[in-house]
């Protein structure tokens, strides 16, 4: 499995192809908005995961929990399994 | 281009309250970000001391917490900082910074610094 | 509280020279590392985040890798002006942390 294969970023460009772990059965795509900005402003944030689960399990920080569990910034984790089929812009 | 510029007392009396500005130009201090104040003793490291965001919302160092207080005024750009009952271990170089949360939280731009010294 | 643990603590090397400073955590804290330099009587400025996304303006010949608990920051051709204080802080939870920085110094 290829996935694309960014961290913390807040331009899609940055995302480099990666093949992954033979463990690794997902593509992830997460995505971090802040909902009260104006400009949506956001970072992507992109993967080969185990599991779907395991990400929304393991990839956020404590830090940042916090500020998602207060709402202050929204989660969107999406998987997918084919190559490169998280290389969607966002 | 964020600017951040601190401003307040430069020398503070032991016991007394040290308290410092930071005012924002370029951005909005309502943005997607928190804003932090982080001191460096001289000739020493980095100290994180804390944060605010712009709806109030603060994190504190538990090593100071029971001393701090970090505001913002959202109407003047600006966040401030308090720190009470300091001694001589808090004479440092103390700087604003923004943060950037998206990216996981790393401290993109900075104030130029203010030195505090506490003394008598 | 998480520790962070630079070395060397300080460096001499020259111009041209490619240069490693590392940084572990004292538990695992993912990619949220970021890198710092800072010249005396200067801010800290951003090189690095996320372990290893550089940050905009930054020249190239910086670079950092790693996860988990261990990193490193590497400088490819050491310029004058890449002479200063190097640190690490991590962002994984609150207190955050700073490295003791590593003084890179013109041999």
């Known amino acids: 499995l290829w996935c694309q294969d960014c961290t913390l970023t807040t331009n899609s460009s940055h995302c480099t192809p990666k093949q992954c772990q033979p463990s690794d059965t997902v593509c992830a795509s997460v995505r971090i908005t802040d909902p009260s900005s104006s400009r949506k402003d956001h970072s992507v944030n992109k993967m080969c995961a185990s599991s779907c689960d395991f990400v929304k399990r393991h990839f956020f920080s404590d830090y940042l929990m916090g500020f998602i569990n207060s709402g202050i910034l929204k989660v969107d984790v999406d998987c997918c399994e084919k190559d490169l089929c998280n290389g969607a812009a966002g | 281009q964020v600017q951040l510029q601190e401003s307040g007392p430069g020398l503070v009396k032991p016991s007394g309250t040290l308290s410092l500005t930071c005012a924002v130009s370029?951005?909005?201090?309502?943005?997607?970000?928190?804003w932090s104040w982080v001191r460096q003793p001289p000739g020493k490291g980095l100290e994180w001391i804390g944060e605010?965001?712009?709806?109030?919302?603060?994190n504190y160092n538990p090593s100071l917490k029971s001393r701090v207080t970090i505001s913002v005024d959202k109407s003047k750009n600006q966040f401030s900082l308090k720190l009470s009952s300091v001694t001589a271990a808090d004479t440092a170089v103390y700087y604003c910074a923004r943060v950037d949360i998206l990216t996981g939280g790393n401290f993109d731009y900075w104030g130029q610094g203010t030195l505090v010294t506490v003394s008598s | 509280d998480i520790q962070m643990t630079q070395s060397p603590s300080s460096l001499s090397a020259s111009v041209g020279d490619r240069v490693t400073i590392t940084c572990r955590a004292s538990q695992s804290i993912s990619s949220y590392l970021n890198w710092y330099q800072q010249k005396p009587g200067k801010a800290p400025k951003l090189l690095i985040y996320?372990?290893?996304s550089l940050q905009s303006g930054v020249p190239s010949r910086f670079s950092g890798s790693g996860s988990g608990t261990d990193f490193t920051l590497t400088i490819s051709s050491l310029q004058p002006e890449d002479f200063a204080t190097y640190y690490c802080?991590?962002?994984?939870?609150?207190?955050?942390?700073f490295g003791q920085g590593t003084r890179l110094e013109i041999k």
């Open positions: 996320a372990a290893s």
């Open positions: 370029g951005g909005s201090i309502s943005s997607s970000n928190w």
């Open positions: 605010i965001y712009h709806s109030g919302s603060t």
């Open positions: 802080q991590q962002s994984y939870s609150t207190p955050i942390t």
